[in-house]
Interface confidence: low
């Protein structure tokens, strides 16, 4: 995109604003290193998982890929669904922006939201009657 | 605490910084629904983790939880570590806000963290050599 | 319990000289960039001044720049602002904040201190 320099100086703290409505710089800085990617695991996975697309037009990021648990048990080392076992999700709640007032291009609002990451394998529950 | 009421227009679009930098409201809406604590399972995973606190105060989230998985290999129904299976970390790139100018209480820069949610349990690669 | 408490605000003349302080205890202040911020009399908030974790830079918002000076001392957990040639207009709440982004509300700011600049 665009490179705007940066001035050095702070934005105008302004009186009815601040300190709930701040200056964002929407440039990206990506500190971050690449992960694996999930198709390195994706067939070994013991609890399995497909990604669904999220796609908000009124949200920054945009689009979010939500992981949907392919079964309710576990895939055991033969590849077979083993029911003792069960895929559980693993939920974050991430930063996202939401475009407030909805027609305005450059005011957001920051926005909890929970997305299920991928899924993890759990030993169920055991009671035992007595 | 003191709130501080919000203008029903836009905000203007300064010509030096639309769109690379724009507006945000920083009380955050909340959306999401609490997700199942990971205490709840977290004694029942079979490819178990840790989750160790990074702190940032120029970062918001200031508090990153990052999970290390505790093992290498998986645990089975006995409780044991099996060997022939691996736990794995499940990544996710998410966005903070940056304190940028460093100095400025009022402006901030996107970033992308990759964070480390949670561990699975994956089979191994079987080579079979001929 | 994260605690901040300023002191030394007052009544003074138009260019007039006062020394505010802020005591600071519940977190480790050392980690830390301090800011003040005033709030004028039925206007909102406006950013003064901050300082960095060592003490090593200042910032000031360009109407203070040159009469106020902004300093602190870890090992006592105090934040300092001195203000010299005071004007009308500085005449505020002044109070100093812990260098968190969020939360904005005032969680771990102090009561203020009442700085009046009146003849």
């Known amino acids: 995109g665009i490179m705007i320099p940066q001035s050095p100086g702070c934005p105008k703290t302004e009186d009815k604003n601040f300190p709930q409505h701040v200056r964002v710089n929407l440039n990206i800085l990506n500190r971050s290193t690449p992960a694996r990617r999930p198709s390195d695991y994706s067939k070994r996975f013991t609890s399995p998982w497909t990604l669904q697309r999220n796609e908000d037009p009124e949200r920054y990021s945009s689009v979010i890929w939500e992981a949907k648990c392919s079964h309710s048990g576990c895939i055991n080392a033969e590849g077979k669904e083993d029911h003792h076992m069960n895929s559980v999700p693993i939920q974050q709640e991430i930063l996202v922006l939401r475009r407030e007032p909805r027609h305005c291009p450059n005011s957001f609002r920051l926005e909890k939201v929970m997305v299920t990451v991928g899924c993890t394998c759990v030993t169920p529950i055991v009671r035992h009657i007595s | 605490g003191i709130m501080i009421p919000q203008s029903p227009g836009c905000p203007k679009t300064e010509d030096k910084n639309f769109p690379q930098h724009v507006r945000v409201n920083l009380n955050i809406l909340n959306r999401s629904t609490p997700a199942r604590r990971p205490s709840d399972y977290s004694k029942r995973f079979t490819s178990p983790w840790t989750l160790q606190r990074n702190e940032d105060p120029e970062r918001y989230s200031s508090v990153i939880w990052e999970a290390k998985c505790s093992h290498s290999g998986c645990i089975n129904a006995e409780g044991k570590e099996d060997h022939h299976m691996n736990s794995v970390p499940i990544q996710q790139e998410i966005l903070v806000l940056r304190r940028e100018p460093r100095h400025c209480p009022n402006s901030f820069r996107l970033e992308k963290v990759m964070v480390t949610v949670g561990c699975t349990c994956v089979t191994p690669i079987v080579r079979h050599i001929s | 319990e994260v605690q901040l408490v300023e002191s030394g605000g007052g009544l003074v003349q138009p260019g007039g000289s006062l020394r505010l302080s802020c005591a600071a205890s519940?977190?480790?202040?050392?980690?830390?960039?301090m800011y003040w911020v005033r709030q004028a009399p039925g206007k909102g908030l406006e950013w003064v001044a901050s300082?960095?974790?060592?003490?090593?830079?200042?910032y000031y918002v360009d109407s203070v720049k040159g009469r106020f000076t902004i300093s602190r001392d870890n090992a006592k957990k105090s934040l300092f602002l001195q203000m010299n040639s005071l004007r009308a207009e500085d005449t505020a709440v002044y109070y100093c904040?812990?260098?968190?982004?969020?939360?904005?509300?005032?969680?771990?700011w102090g009561q203020g201190t009442l700085v009046t600049v009146s003849s």
């Open positions: 904040a812990k260098g968190e982004i969020l939360p904005l509300y005032f969680d771990y």
């Open positions: 519940g977190f480790t202040f050392s980690s830390y960039r």
């Open positions: 300082i960095e974790q060592d003490g090593s830079e200042e």
